[in-house]
């Protein structure tokens, strides 16, 4: 059950009516109210398991629970995506799936969970203590990442027991940008509502734009907000660094999605029925996502924090428990 915060288009005021401020104060509270009501704290989970049939084959499963809509999932290994991790796969709900060796099969299991199977042979194969991370970019919560690994003592075919403490990281830009804006927005909304009691409400103008209104951009983080929070960073130590996958990564910029077959690009697939649950269209994300792919072109995925929804500040990261806590 994912709610999407649809935001009405901001219209220029009709001449001779309320004027710009009157109209903006009418629309903005609803925008902010929608965001205030739908915002929660997402949970991200990661499961790493070694397949009993192929001892060096891994399956990584990741899920996202939140009220927002997922716009991108990035799976990496060797650490978080923004902290030196190597991208294994990128899954977009509409534009499809891109994966790099040793990833064998990445797919949507449901609208909110994905799985990735890794090949077990060759120089770039993972080892038992490799850390795998999943980053979910969503609106309006921002970007959330959780990590997990398979303890060396695990029996093949069993998933990791809940003893290790994988990492969960919510990008500071996401947290500060979204939370800050929402907090400010909620306060501002209360202020507006209080002021509204003391004067008559302006008349609502009918919207003359298309019904597919753009989503509010209030969640794009400011540079100032990114620098404000500092959390202790614990490095992930992996004695088994993946091989550099230079040859596997295209450097072609945003058009790399275009090479996907169209049948792979549309819907998250269920494990039984591969076309069971289509994801609703998210046309309003296009401008943000175009920026994302442009960024991907400048910085190929394996070089670090390319393909993140928000710019990763060079600041520290938090070491967290197994449950996607921030």
């Amino acid at each position: 059950m994912r709610t999407e915060a649809q935001v009405p288009a901001l219209q220029p005021p009709e001449p001779g009516l309320e004027g710009a401020m009157g109209h903006r104060t009418l629309v903005l509270p609803w925008v902010l109210l929608t965001l205030c009501v739908t915002a929660g704290t997402p949970e991200v989970w990661v499961q790493v398991r070694m397949e009993a049939t192929e001892l060096s084959s891994f399956t990584i499963r990741c899920g996202f629970l939140g009220s927002g809509s997922i716009s991108l999932v990035t799976v990496s290994w060797g650490g978080p995506n923004g902290a030196g991790g190597t991208t294994l796969a990128v899954l977009h709900p509409e534009r499809g799936i891109r994966q790099w060796a040793p990833a064998r099969q990445a797919r949507w299991e449901t609208q909110s969970s994905i799985s990735l199977i890794l090949e077990g042979s060759g120089a770039s194969s993972p080892c038992a203590n490799t850390t795998f991370c999943c980053k979910f970019a969503s609106f309006p919560e921002g970007s959330w990442e959780a990590c997990g690994s398979l303890p060396p003592s695990s029996d093949p075919g069993l998933s990791a027991p809940p003893t290790p403490a994988p990492i969960l990281r919510a990008d500071l830009a996401g947290i500060l940008g979204v939370s800050g804006v929402l907090l400010f927005g909620c306060v501002y909304l209360l202020h507006l509502l209080r002021r509204h009691k003391h004067r008559p409400a302006p008349r609502l103008q009918p919207s003359r734009t298309s019904p597919q209104a753009p989503r509010a951009r209030a969640w794009a983080p400011s540079q100032a907000s990114q620098a404000a929070l500092h959390v202790p960073y614990a490095t992930i130590n992996t004695s088994c660094r993946p091989a550099t996958l230079d040859t596997a990564h295209p450097h072609g910029g945003p058009s790399w999605w275009a090479s996907l077959p169209t049948h792979a690009a549309h819907r998250p697939q269920g494990p039984a029925a591969w076309a069971s649950t289509p994801i609703p269209a998210r046309g309003s994300f296009v401008s943000v996502e175009n920026g994302l792919y442009a960024q991907a072109g400048e910085r190929p995925p394996h070089t670090g924090p390319g393909l993140t929804l928000f710019p990763d500040p060079r600041g520290p990261r938090a070491m967290e428990g197994p449950l996607g806590v921030r």
Epitope: M1, R2, G40, T41, E43, W45, V46, Q47, R61, G63, L65, G66, S67, E109, T110, Q111, S112, S113, G148, S159, A160, P161, P162, A165, G270, P271, A272, A273, S276, T277, E320, G321, P322, L323, G324, V325, R326
Partner: antibody, heavy 118, light 107 residues
């Protein structure tokens, strides 16, 4: 070992409020989400919501949004659920549970029995 | 909300039997299902997560299977201590939802 110790039986009057507690021990409290679940006599389980002990972030079942308020006290490793405007429909056993890897409730409290009666 | 339907409220079995408890989701939940056992007057106990992974300490006579919308908890060689109520739960999306439960009774 991991334990979730819930507060004892509560008998309250309709319209009143009550605050149930869930004290965690045997693990790092701030590393695991705490969930709350309701079970009415002879009935199934209903998810109320969850809380992230490290920052107090919450998610609620829409059905319980105006009924329950979840909080934590990190210093005492305790999670709380305040239930307000109580009616007989709120009479139930309330469980707190820890979310384990990758996602299931690996440890549960013993449950708090709440009876709302005049 | 995703509805998890356990169509059989009660199931009769005998010690040593093999029994299958079923659960059906109203929409695709992938493998994001857990199973719990609850005995009268006790808290639920986790048996299976990710549809088929046994929780630590759970006897191997308990086995979960299924994906998408159809899930099964199979208890082979039923023991007297297995007579309890069994709940499925989806964790694919909020709100998390449970099945209504299936009570395992002696024939």
């Amino acid at each position: 070992q991991v334990q979730l110790q819930e507060s004892g039986t509560e008998l309250v009057k309709p319209g009143a409020s009550v605050k149930l507690s869930c004290k965690a021990s045997g693990y790092t409290f701030t590393s695991y989400w705490i969930h709350w679940v309701k079970q009415r006599p002879g009935q199934g389980l209903e998810w109320i919501g969850n809380i992230n002990p490290s920052n107090g972030g919450t998610n609620y079942n829409e059905k319980f949004k105006s009924k329950a308020a979840l909080t934590v006290d990190k210093s005492s490793s305790t999670a709380y659920m305040q239930l307000s405007s109580l009616t007989s429909e709120d009479s139930a056993v309330y469980y707190c549970a820890r979310r384990g890897l990758p996602y299931f409730f690996d440890y549960w409290g013993q449950g708090t029995t709440l009876t709302v009666s005049s | 909300d995703i509805v998890m339907t356990q169509s059989q409220k009660f199931m009769s079995t005998s010690v040593g039997d093999r029994v299958s408890v079923t659960c059906k989701g109203s929409q695709n939940v992938g493998y994001n299902v857990a199973w719990y056992q609850q005995k009268p007057g006790q808290s639920p106990k986790a048996l299976v997560y990710s549809a088929s992974d046994r929780h630590s300490g759970v006897p191997d006579r308990f086995a979960g299977s299924g994906s998408g919308t159809d899930f099964t908890l199979t208890i082979s060689n039923v023991q007297s201590e297995d007579l309890a109520e069994y709940f499925c739960q989806q964790y694919n999306s909020y709100p998390l939802t449970f099945g209504a439960g299936t009570k395992l009774e002696l024939k």
